[in-house]
């Protein structure tokens, strides 16, 4: 069966500092040496690319310098962290995994992680 399944948590709550972390795990049907991981955000039927990184198996996952994502990889598991999130960024974050090399190419798309972001209440001014 030519299948690559991707698993990710259903729901994650971002921290008060606007940081959300989740694991994206894939069952690889082949021995890939080059893997691309993309985080897609789906909200109101609009899909946008949040970030993407290509890594060589055994090496670290590196996103672009201006990316809001960071991550680490271990085997067929990627630990993703998205920062700078605000309430308006609440939505479904989908993990897409592509086995880029060697051939054949395989695609795997997770069901998505619903990330809830709650903006912190501003601290009331204190009079001393």
């Amino acid at each position: 069966c030519k299948a690559m399944h991707v698993a990710q948590p259903a729901v994650v709550l971002a921290s008060s500092r606007g940081i959300a972390s989740f694991v994206c795990e894939y069952a690889s049907p082949g021995k890939a040496t080059e893997v691309r991981v993309t985080v897609l955000r789906q909200a109101d039927s609009q899909v946008t690319e949040v970030c993407a990184a290509t890594y060589m198996m055994g090496n670290e996952l590196t996103f672009l310098d201006d990316s809001i994502c960071t991550g680490t990889s271990s085997g067929n598991q990627v630990n993703l962290t998205i920062q700078g999130l605000r309430a308006m960024d609440t939505g479904l974050y989908i993990c897409k995994v592509e086995l880029m090399y060697p051939p054949p190419y395989y695609l795997g798309i997770g069901n998505g992680t619903q990330i809830y972001v709650i903006d912190p209440e501003p601290c009331p001014d204190s009079d001393f």
């Epitope: 069966c1 030519k2 897609l40 993407a52 190419y105 695609l107 795997g108």
Partner: antibody, heavy 119, light 108 residues
Framework: QVQLVESGGGVVQPGRSLRLSCAAS????????MHWVRQAPGKGLEWVAV????????YYVDSVKGRFTISRDNSNNTLYLQMNSLRAEDTAVYYC????????????WGQGTLVTVSS | EIVLTQSPGTLSLSPGEGATLSCRAS???????LAWYQQKPGQAPRLLIY???SRATGIPDRFSGSGSGTDFTLTISRLEPEDFAVYYC?????????FGPGTKVDIK
């Protein structure tokens, strides 16, 4: 809006070469896989080649391996197909098509350019 | 390589009738990564369905897709005059990406 415009088709003799171009606009070109799909006269669709993102990874259908080369210029939003050692069976309309965020299916296609290989 | 077989080769129907088109894969592939296209003479194909069952933007709800594993179906609930065309399925779970040979839906 997304636009894909192919050019470079024409009549060429067997064994000769031709280079097709596809000018893309209306989207972030480097974020998508780009493909060539062909259709011989009166026949079905045949996927030919794909090139991903930064251009390092390329795959081809077996029948064109070693003869065709797909490439892209992300700074100019242009996709290319260099076709060498052309054969009569390469005669077809060649479409450039964009992959999607959710996989390599094709939501946008060019109008197609006809390549005729004949002596 | 995953080979896709479509049946029937030609379907002769009248406007208002329903159409059921089949696409069968030579082996099971990733998570229903199957698309359907419509093509009219002299035009580029138009995406109808992806992910086996998700309608593409702007596609009328008389078009629906279903199936999983190796067997997939495109259903057109009530044929409109503009629906008479050739329909192709395509798998995109693994390379090489492959199309079925097509089903022609023509007017009876």
């Amino acid at each position: 809006q997304v636009q894909l415009v192919e050019s470079g088709g024409g009549v060429v003799q067997p064994g000769r070469s031709l280079r097709l171009s596809c000018a893309a606009s209306g989207f972030t070109f480097s974020s998508f896989g780009m493909h060539w799909v062909r259709q011989a006269p009166g026949k079905g669709l045949e996927w030919v080649a794909v090139i991903w993102y930064d251009g390092r990874n390329k795959y081809y259908v077996d029948s064109v391996k070693g003869r065709f080369t797909i490439s892209r210029d992300n700074s100019n939003n242009t996709l290319y197909l260099q076709m060498n050692s052309l054969r009569a069976e390469d005669t077809a309309v060649y479409y450039c098509a964009r992959g999607e965020f959710f996989g390599e299916f094709f939501d946008y296609w060019g109008q197609g350019t006809l390549v005729t290989v004949s002596s | 390589e995953i080979v896709l077989t479509q049946s029937p080769g030609t379907l002769s129907l009248s406007p208002g009738e329903g159409a059921t088109l089949s696409c069968r894969a030579s082996q099971s592939f990733s998570s229903n990564y199957l698309a359907w296209y419509q093509q009219k003479p002299g035009q580029a194909p138009r995406l109808l369905i992806y992910g086996a069952s998700s309608r593409a933007t702007g596609i009328p709800d008389r078009f629906s897709g279903s199936g999983s594993g190796t067997d997939f179906t495109l259903t057109i609930s009530r044929l409109e005059p503009e629906d008479f065309a050739v329909y192709y399925c395509q798998q995109y779970g693994t390379s090489p990406f492959t199309f079925g040979p097509g089903t022609k839906v023509d007017i009876k």
